[in-house]
C-alpha cells in the first residue's frame, strides 16, 4: 500500500537475542516522502514508554528507506526489554510496534545459545 504518511517498519512481537558485552544496533526502518521526520526511541516500562534521551543514535539512509539506529556499545544486562520508536510527522505522533531484546549474560552462558533456545528457555535470559 503506497502512502505518503510516515511508516515505521518494525514487526509486531519481533525479537532479538543478543549477548551482554557485544555491540548491537537496533534499527527503526522509516519510510517518508519529503521531509525526514523527527524520530525517537523509548523503552517500555509496564505500559509507559520511557524516552531514551541520552543514548547514541544515528541515521542510515538507503534508496527507498531510512533507518534510525539506537546504538548499544556495548550491550548491558539491563538493556533487556522492549523498545519502540516514534516519529513526529505533521504534528502527528506515529508509534512503531515494540521489539524485544533478550540479553544473555556471557558469565552465565558458556556458549552462545541458539535463537530457539533464546525464545524458549527464559531462564537463560534476563527478563
Amino acid at each position: 500500500k503506497e502512502s505518503c504518511d510516515v511508516q515505521l517498519y518494525i514487526k509486531r512481537q519481533s525479537e532479538h537475542s543478543i549477548l551482554a558485552g557485544d555491540p548491537f544496533e537496533l534499527e527503526c526502518p522509516v519510510k517518508y516522502c519529503a521531509n525526514r521526520p523527527h524520530v525517537t526511541w523509548c523503552k517500555l516500562n509496564g505500559t509507559t514508554c520511557v524516552k531514551l534521551e541520552d543514548r547514541q543514535t544515528s541515521w542510515k539512509e538507503e534508496k527507498n528507506i531510512s533507518f534510525f539506529i539506537l546504538h548499544f556499545e556495548p550491550v548491558l544486562p539491563n538493556d533487556n526489554g522492549s523498545y519502540r520508536c516514534s516519529a513526529n510527522f505533521q504534528s502527528n505522533l506515529i508509534e512503531s510496534h515494540s521489539t524485544t531484546l533478550y540479553v544473555t549474560d556471557v558469565k552465565s552462558a558458556s556458549e552462545r545459545p541458539s535463537k530457539d533456545e533464546m525464545a524458549s528457555r527464559p531462564w537463560l535470559l534476563y527478563r
Epitope: 500500500k1 511508516q7 517498519y9 518494525i10 514487526k11 509486531r12 512481537q13 519481533s14 525479537e15 532479538h16 537475542s17 517500555l44 505500559t47 522492549s82 508509534e95 510496534h97 515494540s98 535463537k115 530457539d116 533464546m118 525464545a119
Partner: antibody, heavy 119, light 112 residues
Framework: QVQLQESGPGLVKPSGTLSLTCAAS????????MYWVRQPPGKGLEWIGR????????RYNPSFKSRATVSADKSKNQASLKLSSLTAADTAVYYC????????????WGQGTTVTVSS | DIVMTQSPDSLAVSLGERATINCKSS???????????LNWLQQKPGQSPKRLIY???KLDSGVPDRFSGSGSGTDFTLTISSVQAEDVAVYYC?????????FGQGTKLEIK
C-alpha cells in the same frame, strides 16, 4: 496478490518424519511471519508454530516443541515444516499461512496438504 | 495457554436472518500496543480457512459488509446481518496476541 503453495508427501509411516514446504508468491517473506496450522479430520484448528523469516526466530506450540521445526529460506521465498516421531494422531490437513508482520494488511492461508500417517 | 470458547457450536438460520457467534477468551487479548489481536476465520466446506475480520472489527478487503465484528476485553462477537447461502461455513475466532496462538473450537453455520 499473496499466494501460498504447500507441497509434501501425502503418506508417511509411523515414527517417521514429515517434511512440508510452503512457497510464497506476491510478497517478500522477510516482511511477514509464516506459520503452520493443522486440522485433524473433522476437527478444529491447531497452531503448530511460526517463523520470522527476516531473522529465523521461531515460536512453537509447546504441544509440538520437541517434534516440530519451522525454517525459512529467503532466497527461495519459502518456509518449511518438519514434524518427527509421527503417530496416527498426526494425520491431518496441514496449512501454512502468512501474515503481514507490520500492519495486519493481509493474512493468507495455503490450500492445505493432507497427510496420512499409516504403515 | 489462552482458551478460546465459542458459542454456539452450531446454528441454523433462515436466509436473510441475522446470525450471531460469540467468542470468549480466558485472558485479555491486548498486546503491548494496547490493541486486541482477535481474528475471525471462515472455512467453507472443502476449503482452507480465510480471514474475515482482524483486530476485532476490521473487515478484510473483499469481505461483504453484512459481516461485522465487535467486542472488547474477553468477549467478542461475529455478526452476519443477513445470512446468504454462500455463508454456510465453519467460523473460528483465534487470538494472535499470546503464544501459543489458539483457536476457538468453531461454530458451524447452516441454513434453516
Amino acid at each position: 496478490q499473496v499466494q501460498l503453495q504447500e507441497s509434501g508427501p501425502g503418506l508417511v509411516k509411523p515414527s517417521g518424519t514429515l517434511s512440508l514446504t510452503c512457497a510464497a508468491s506476491g510478497v517478500n517473506i522477510k516482511d511477514t511471519y509464516m506459520y503452520w496450522v493443522r486440522q485433524p479430520p473433522g476437527k478444529g484448528l491447531e497452531w503448530i508454530g511460526r517463523i520470522d523469516p527476516a531473522n529465523g526466530y521461531t515460536r512453537y506450540n509447546p504441544s509440538f516443541k520437541s517434534r516440530a521445526t519451522v525454517s525459512a529460506d529467503k532466497s527461495k521465498n519459502q518456509a518449511s515444516l518438519k514434524l518427527s516421531s509421527l503417530t496416527a494422531a498426526d494425520t491431518a490437513v496441514y496449512y501454512c499461512a502468512v501474515n503481514d508482520g507490520y500492519f495486519e494488511y493481509f493474512d493468507v492461508w495455503g490450500q492445505g496438504t493432507t497427510v496420512t500417517v499409516s504403515s | 495457554d489462552i482458551v478460546m470458547t465459542q458459542s454456539p457450536d452450531s446454528l441454523a438460520v433462515s436466509l436473510g436472518e441475522r446470525a450471531t457467534i460469540n467468542c470468549k477468551s480466558s485472558q485479555s487479548l491486548l498486546d503491548s500496543d494496547g490493541k486486541p489481536y482477535l481474528n475471525w476465520l471462515q472455512q467453507k466446506p472443502g476449503q482452507s480457512p480465510k480471514r474475515l475480520i482482524y483486530l476485532v472489527s476490521k473487515l478484510d478487503s473483499g469481505v461483504p459488509d453484512r459481516f461485522s465484528g465487535s467486542g472488547s476485553g474477553t468477549d467478542f462477537t461475529l455478526t452476519i446481518s443477513s445470512v446468504q447461502a454462500e455463508d454456510v461455513a465453519v467460523y473460528y475466532c483465534w487470538q494472535d496476541t499470546h503464544f501459543p496462538r489458539t483457536f476457538g473450537q468453531g461454530t458451524k453455520l447452516e441454513i434453516k
